[in-house]
Interface confidence: low
């Protein structure tokens, strides 16, 4: 008992002065308490507790549920407290079934002895099974049976507690341990689409998938950088004991060019947090935007290849596309096809193959692509390159000699008089008269031009070559000139 | 040739007003898009605005929406910045930028003007 | 809106150096990305549009390169009038520059 100092509060006083009392079931308990400021009786055992405002407690006819902790409490909150069991052969364990441990801590088996002076206090497997190698315990007759440091492995666990009374072991009723897993990794997120791109008024919905190991994991979705709350809806479920999932949908029903953004889902639990975000970008309509992949104006030479490549943006998806030349619309020859298979792509390849082009084949080829909300063209202008093709040589009535060529670029014409039968011709002779005939037809075809001389400045027999030449090639012809002879045309030769 | 030339810059109270002009030349003013940008002391670029040729439509960045406009005359070849309740973060140079583009419609600046310094202080 | 972050902010090299300047964006900006050049007292210069092209009369030794979010412009070989500050800027959604990247003498 405590003793009692003057001038100093003191904790009350029980009778009897034990701090445990074994009583047999049947008996009576009396416990007084003395104390000139006494307060209350508090009796506790598992999660029953009661009060007794009388400074003697009396129970006349103790049970099994009488056993537990009497305390006495005075009012300076000083107290005093007595265990009392109430031995009962047939009720050898009170019991509180819900078990509930937290990996990685110690949990309580909550099932306190009415007679302490039972043997062999412990744990058991049910239906004889051994109990887990690692699992360690401490029992406490007056608390129960103390699990160290539960593993994720006991959940589920069906035990136990057992005594030995008279050479017999006894076991409680059954006990099944449910393992609340600690939080050893961030959860899981993910999103079911990393960007959208919608036009206004269409709906947006996406879904994040938080996964974990148990449903305290915290998840919402965030708009980057602001505070407005967002309607989200859940859907979980547990695959296995520490498997947990959980979607979370938001939605946006009409979707405004305002609502474009960065979108987060944020999860958390104890030990971290993740995230993962979706982009949505929202239209007034849709689009399309058209990039050449090479210059939009082309020079080819005559025979060869060129392939003519676009590169295009389109939303929604395109529903028509198209290679057009001189009001022609290709039917092959070209392919066109997206630059990904991913399901949000919105870029497209369109490839139109030209073969061998003739020096006829040049122009403007157009390519079109159309979608249900606009339409799109881009040209190239293909110039082909030809060697130069003299078309006429002759004498011209007024005594000119008159050279036409044509060819792309531009043909030059000089002109060259050899004396004698040499085709070999080095001394230039200047023009009389140059015309381009067609500068002002059409700009992708052969450019046709006119050279003169006048045949009157030649003094002796010989030859006349007619050279027309660009950057493809050359051609010539010649013309024999007998001296006050009529000049005919040679044989056109090209070297 | 191609050039732009700011005016209209200077000293002003915060609250104040200013109005900027840009003069084209050397190209047909009404075929491109424009816009104005700027440049704080010490600072990078940061777009201000900007008006499409075809369209009339105007652009802002955030922070001035509201406060400025930007317009333009074709028959005068000339764009315009109105600048109201000016605030000290709005002190920088002011460039004018035309509007190429590639493709249909993906724009880029291609030509600048030497800018015009606008100072808001009181 | 869509940021865009330039590194590094500023570097030092000397003539005849590969320099290499990088710029990220906040979202995917497809490859709607320009670089442009900017000496001090002086208006910007585009050199680059749409991540790769090269503006008329910019030297070869400039080029561009990426996708998405990602964005690269290289000087090949680093030239006495190439010391200035680059900036990137992206016409995805309206535009926004990076912070710029100062090329110093080492």
């Known amino acids: 008992q405590p003793s009692v100092s003057p001038g100093e509060p003191s904790p009350p006083s029980i009778h009897p002065g034990k701090s445990d009392l074994i009583v047999r079931v049947g008996d009576e308990i009396r416990l007084l308490c003395t104390d000139p400021g006494f307060v209350k009786w508090t009796f506790e055992i598992l999660d029953e507790t009661n009060e007794n405002k009388q400074n003697e407690w009396i129970t006349e006819k103790a049970e099994a549920t009488n056993t537990g902790k009497y305390t006495c409490t005075n009012k300076h909150g000083l107290s005093n407290s007595i265990y009392v069991f109430v031995r009962d052969p047939a009720k050898l364990f009170l019991v509180d079934r819900s078990l509930y441990g937290k990996e990685d801590n110690d949990t309580l088996v909550r099932c306190p002895l009415t007679d302490p002076e039972v043997t062999n206090y412990s744990l058991k497997g049910c239906q004889g099974k051994p109990l887990p190698k690692d699992l360690r315990f401490i029992p406490d007759p007056k608390a129960g049976i103390m699990i160290k440091s539960v593993k994720r492995a006991y959940h589920r666990l069906c035990l136990h507690c057992s005594v030995d009374q008279e050479g017999k072991s006894v076991l409680s009723e059954k006990f099944i341990l449910k393992v609340r897993p600690a939080f050893k990794a961030v959860p899981v997120v993910s999103v079911s689409k990393a960007s959208y791109l919608l036009r206004e008024g269409e709906e947006f919905t996406v879904t994040c998938t938080i996964k974990d190991v148990s449903s305290s994991v915290y998840s919402t979705w965030k708009r980057e950088n602001s505070q407005t709350k967002l309607q989200e809806k859940y859907n979980s479920w547990h695959h296995g004991d520490f498997n947990y999932e959980r979607q979370a949908t938001l939605t946006i029903s009409s979707a405004r060019v305002n609502d474009s953004g960065v979108f987060m889902c944020y999860a958390n639990n104890t030990f971290g947090s993740a995230n993962v975000t979706t982009t949505l970008e929202v239209v007034d309509k849709g689009f399309i935007n058209i990039f050449p992949m090479i210059n939009t104006t082309v020079f080819v030479n005559d025979g060869e290849n060129v392939d003519l490549i676009v590169e295009y943006e389109a939303f929604p998806k395109p529903e028509h596309q198209q290679w057009i030349y001189m009001n022609r619309t290709f039917t092959d020859k070209w392919e066109d096809y997206p630059k990904s298979e991913n399901e949000s792509n919105i870029r497209y390849v369109s490839e139109l193959h030209l073969t061998r082009l003739k020096g006829t084949e040049g122009g403007t080829y157009t390519f079109l692509v159309s979608n249900s909300d606009v339409n799109a063209a881009i040209a190239f202008n293909v110039y082909v390159n030809t060697k130069p093709e003299i078309l006429t040589y002759d004498r011209l009535v007024n005594g000119m000699l008159q050279c036409v060529a044509a060819g792309f670029p531009e043909p030059t014409i000089d002109w060259y008089f050899c004396p004698g039968t040499e085709q070999r011709c080095s001394a230039s002779v200047l023009p009389v008269d140059v015309q381009t005939l067609n500068s002002s037809g059409p700009p992708f075809g052969k450019l046709v031009v006119q050279s003169s001389i006048d045949s009157s400045a030649f003094k002796h027999n010989g030859t006349v070559e007619c050279k027309a030449y660009n950057d493809v090639g050359k051609t010539s012809a010649y013309f024999n000139f007998a001296f006050k002879e009529q000049i005919h045309p040679h044989t056109l030769f090209t070297p | 040739e191609v050039q732009l030339v700011e005016s209209g810059g200077g000293l002003v109270q915060p609250g104040g007003s200013l109005r900027l002009s840009c003069a084209a030349s050397?190209?047909?003013?009404?075929?491109?898009?424009m816009a104005w940008v700027r440049q704080a002391p010490g600072k990078g670029l940061e777009w201000v605005a900007s008006i499409n040729q075809n369209t009339g439509s105007t652009y802002y960045l955030d922070s001035v929406r509201g406060r400025f406009t930007i317009s333009r005359d074709n028959a005068k070849n000339s764009l315009y910045l109105q600048m109201n309740s000016l605030r000290a973060e709005d002190t920088a140079v002011y460039y004018c930028?035309?509007?190429?583009?590639?493709?249909?419609?993906?724009?880029?600046?291609?030509?600048w003007g030497q800018g015009t310094t606008v100072t808001v202080s009181s | 809106d869509i940021q865009m972050t330039q590194s590094p902010s500023s570097l030092s090299a000397s003539v005849g150096d590969r320099v290499t300047i990088t710029c990220r964006a906040s979202?995917?900006?497809?490859?709607?990305l320009n670089w442009y050049q900017q000496k001090p007292g002086k208006a910007p210069k585009l050199l680059i549009y749409?991540?790769?092209r090269l503006q008329s009369g910019v030297p070869s030794r400039f080029s561009g390169s990426g996708s998405g979010t990602d964005f690269t412009l290289t000087i090949s070989s680093l030239q006495p009038e190439d010391f200035a500050t680059y900036y990137c800027q992206q016409g995805r959604r309206l535009w926004s520059f990076g912070g710029g990247t100062k090329v110093e003498i080492k």
């Open positions: 979202q995917s900006i497809s490859s709607y």
């Open positions: 930028a035309r509007g190429d583009y590639y493709g249909t419609t993906y724009w880029y600046f291609d030509v």
């Open positions: 050397g190209f047909t003013f009404s075929d491109y898009y």
């Open positions: 749409y991540t790769s």
